[in-house]
Interface confidence: medium
C-alpha cells in the first residue's frame, strides 16, 4: 500500500521543559504506524506496538539510539544559539519516502514555535533558512563535528536502508488488517430529538468510512470523531441527530480494508446498551 512507503521521524525539543518532562522526544513512523519512540529522559530508542516483535538485527535499536542522541544534542544546542529568549519549541520532520521506481525521496524541514523556518538542502549539503533564528542555528550546527555529513548520511542512506529493511522484516505489521468492532447507539438529545452514534473500535489501517442509511437510503455521514489507540489501532465514531421515535429507521454502514464487504450495523436495543 502506498501509505506504507515512508519512514518519518517527528522530533520535538522545548527550551523550558516542565519538571520531570523530557526536553526532547521523537516518534518514528512507518506510513501511518508509529514504530519508534525516544525521549531525553530515557535516552533509548524503543519499538512501539507490534514492532516490538519485528525480527530485527541485534544492533538495530542501538543504531537508532545513537542517531537520535546526536539529534538530541543538535536540537538542544539550537536553543543555545538562540540565546536566553524564549520559550522555544523546535520541531523537525526528517525521513524518506520510496517512490514508485523504488528511489528514495528525502525530507528534512524544521519549525520554530510552529512555523516552518529552515530545511536541510541536500544539493548544497547545508541547513538553509533566512530567518535570523535559522542563521544562528545553522551556523551552530555547521560547527558541530561533521554534523552536515551525518545529516546527509542519515537522509540519503540510513533512512532508505531502514525503510527497506522494515518493508522486508516487518511486512506482517505493515499488512496488518484489523476489522473494526461496531456499535450503533441512540441517546436523547434536545426535546423531540435523539442522537445516533455509530462507533468503530480497534481497527487498522486507519482508513475507514462510516455513513448512515434511513430506510435503505443515504442519510449523510454525520459529525465525526477519529483517533489512535495506544496499541497502534484506531477508533472512530460518527453522530447524527434524528427525530425521536424515528431511530429504528436508521442503520450505519461501515467500509474498511479488514472487512470483505461493507458491514451493516443495526441499532442496539436499549436493554443491551445499558
Amino acid at each position: 500500500a502506498e501509505s506504507h512507503l515512508s519512514l518519518l521521524y517527528h522530533l520535538t525539543a522545548v527550551s523550558s521543559p516542565a519538571p520531570g518532562t523530557p526536553a526532547f522526544w521523537v516518534s518514528g513512523w512507518l506510513g501511518p504506524q508509529q514504530y519508534l519512540s525516544y525521549n531525553s529522559l530515557r535516552g533509548e530508542a524503543e519499538p512501539c506496538g507490534a514492532w516490538v516483535w519485528e525480527n530485527q538485527v541485534s544492533w538495530y535499536w542501538e543504531k537508532e539510539t545513537t542517531d537520535l542522541r546526536i539529534k538530541e544534542k543538535l536540537f538542544l544546542e539550537a536553543f543555545k544559539a538562540l540565546g536566553g529568549k524564549g520559550p522555544y519549541t523546535l520541531q523537525g520532520l526528517l525521513g524518506c519516502e520510496l517512490g514508485p521506481d523504488n528511489t528514495s525521496v528525502p525530507t528534512a524541514k524544521f519549525a520554530l514555535n510552529g512555523e516552518e523556518f529552515m530545511n536541510f538542502d541536500l544539493k548544497q549539503g547545508t541547513w538553509g533558512g533566512d530567518w535570523p533564528e535559522a542563521l544562528a542555528i545553522s551556523q551552530r550546527w555547521q560547527q558541530q563535528d561533521k554534523a552536515a555529513n551525518k545529516e546527509l548520511t542519515f537522509l540519503l542512506f540510513s533512512c532508505p536502508h531502514r525503510l527497506r529493511e522494515h518493508l522486508e522484516r516487518g511486512r506482517g505489521n505493515l499488512e496488518w488488517k484489523e476489522p473494526p468492532s461496531m456499535r450503533l447507539k441512540a441517546r436523547p438529545s434536545s426535546p423531540g430529538f435523539s442522537v445516533l452514534t455509530c462507533s468503530a473500535f480497534s481497527f487498522y489501517p486507519p482508513e475507514l468510512q462510516l455513513r448512515f442509511l434511513r430506510n435503505g437510503l443515504a442519510a449523510g455521514t454525520g459529525q465525526g470523531d477519529f483517533g489512535p489507540n495506544s496499541d497502534g489501532s484506531f477508533h472512530a465514531s460518527s453522530s447524527l441527530t434524528v427525530k425521536s421515535g424515528d431511530e429504528h429507521h436508521y442503520c450505519c454502514i461501515v467500509q474498511h480494508a479488514g472487512l470483505a464487504q461493507p458491514l451493516r450495523v443495526e441499532l442496539e436495543s436499549p436493554a443491551k446498551s445499558s
Epitope: 512555523e115 516552518e116 548544497q124 547545508t126 541547513w127 538553509g128 530567518w131 535570523p132 542563521l135 545553522s138
Partner: antibody, heavy 118, light 106 residues
Framework: QIQLLQSGAELARPGASVKMSCKAS????????MHWVKQRPGQGLEWIGY????????NYNQKFKDKATLTADKSSSTAYMQLSSLTSEGSAVYYC???????????WGQGTSVTVSS | ENVLTQSPAILSASPGEKVTMTCSAS?????MYWYQQKPGSSPRLLIY???NLASGVPVRFSGSGSGTSYSLTISRMEAEDAATYYC?????????FGGGTKLEIK
C-alpha cells in the same frame, strides 16, 4: 554605520549577462542573509532570493531560478548577483537588502539600474 | 505562492486625516511586514511582526491584523507620508510583496 553600497547602472544587450555587486559595511557580513529584490519601472517589489554569506546557501524564487545567480565573497564583505540571458523584462532596478534580527529587510542598498536594449 | 493583495491601489488624503490601507493574503501568515518607498529612493522598513514600529518611525503609524487580513494605519496624515506602501510576508517561500498602495496628499 550600516551601509549597503551597490554597483553602478548597467546597459546590456538582449541575451547578455550582467553581474552587480553589493558591498556591506558596518556589521558582520556573515551573520545576516542578503536578499535581492527586483522593481520594474512604476511597478511593485519582487523577491528574487537570498544568500547566506556564511555557508553560501542560496534560496531562489522559482521564477528567477534560471535567471539569477547569487554569490558572496566573505573576504570583501560583498554579495553579487548575476543575471543571464537578459530580455526587456530584465530592465529594472535591483536592490540588495539585509535580513535583520527581526525577519525583516532592515537595510537596503541604493539599487542598481539595469537597462536591456538593442 | 502566497499572493498579497493591497487595497486601495491609490489613496488620496488631506493633512491631518486618518488613513487606513489593507493587505489581504491568499494563505494565512503569522505576521505581516510593511515598507515605505518614496520616489527615487529605496524601500524603508516601517513595521515588523504586524504591529511593531521600526526604529525612527513616527508613532502615528500603526499596524494590526491576523491570519489573512492585515492593515496599516496613519492616525494623522502628514505631507511627508506621501509614498507607496508595500506589505510583505515571511511565512512561506517565495517571500512575496503586495502590489503596493500609493498614498497621495490632497
Amino acid at each position: 554605520q550600516i551601509q549597503l553600497l551597490q554597483s553602478g547602472a548597467e546597459l546590456a544587450r538582449p541575451g547578455a549577462s550582467v553581474k552587480m555587486s553589493c558591498k556591506a559595511s558596518g556589521y558582520t557580513f556573515t551573520s545576516y542573509t542578503m536578499h535581492w529584490v527586483k522593481q520594474r519601472p512604476g511597478q511593485g517589489l519582487e523577491w528574487i532570493g537570498y544568500i547566506n554569506p556564511s555557508s553560501g546557501y542560496t534560496n531562489y524564487n522559482q521564477k528567477f531560478k534560471d535567471k539569477a545567480t547569487l554569490t558572496a565573497d566573505k573576504s570583501s564583505s560583498t554579495a553579487y548577483m548575476q543575471l543571464s540571458s537578459l530580455t526587456s523584462e530584465g530592465s529594472a532596478v535591483y536592490y540588495c537588502a539585509r535580513s535583520g534580527l527581526r525577519r525583516v529587510l532592515d537595510y537596503w542598498g541604493q539599487g542598481t539600474s539595469v537597462t536591456v536594449s538593442s | 505562492e502566497n499572493v498579497l493583495t493591497q487595497s486601495p491601489a491609490i489613496l488620496s488624503a488631506s493633512p491631518g486625516e486618518k488613513v487606513t490601507m489593507t493587505c489581504s493574503a491568499s494563505s494565512s501568515v503569522s505576521y505581516m511586514y510593511w515598507y515605505q518607498q518614496k520616489p527615487g529612493s529605496s524601500p524603508r522598513l516601517l513595521i515588523y511582526d504586524t504591529s511593531n514600529l521600526a526604529s525612527g518611525v513616527p508613532v502615528r503609524f500603526s499596524g494590526s491584523g491576523s491570519g489573512t487580513s492585515y492593515s496599516l494605519t496613519i492616525s494623522r496624515m502628514e505631507a511627508e507620508d506621501a509614498a507607496t506602501y508595500y506589505c510583505q510576508q515571511w511565512s512561506s517561500y517565495p517571500r512575496t510583496f503586495g502590489g503596493g498602495t500609493k498614498l497621495e496628499i490632497k
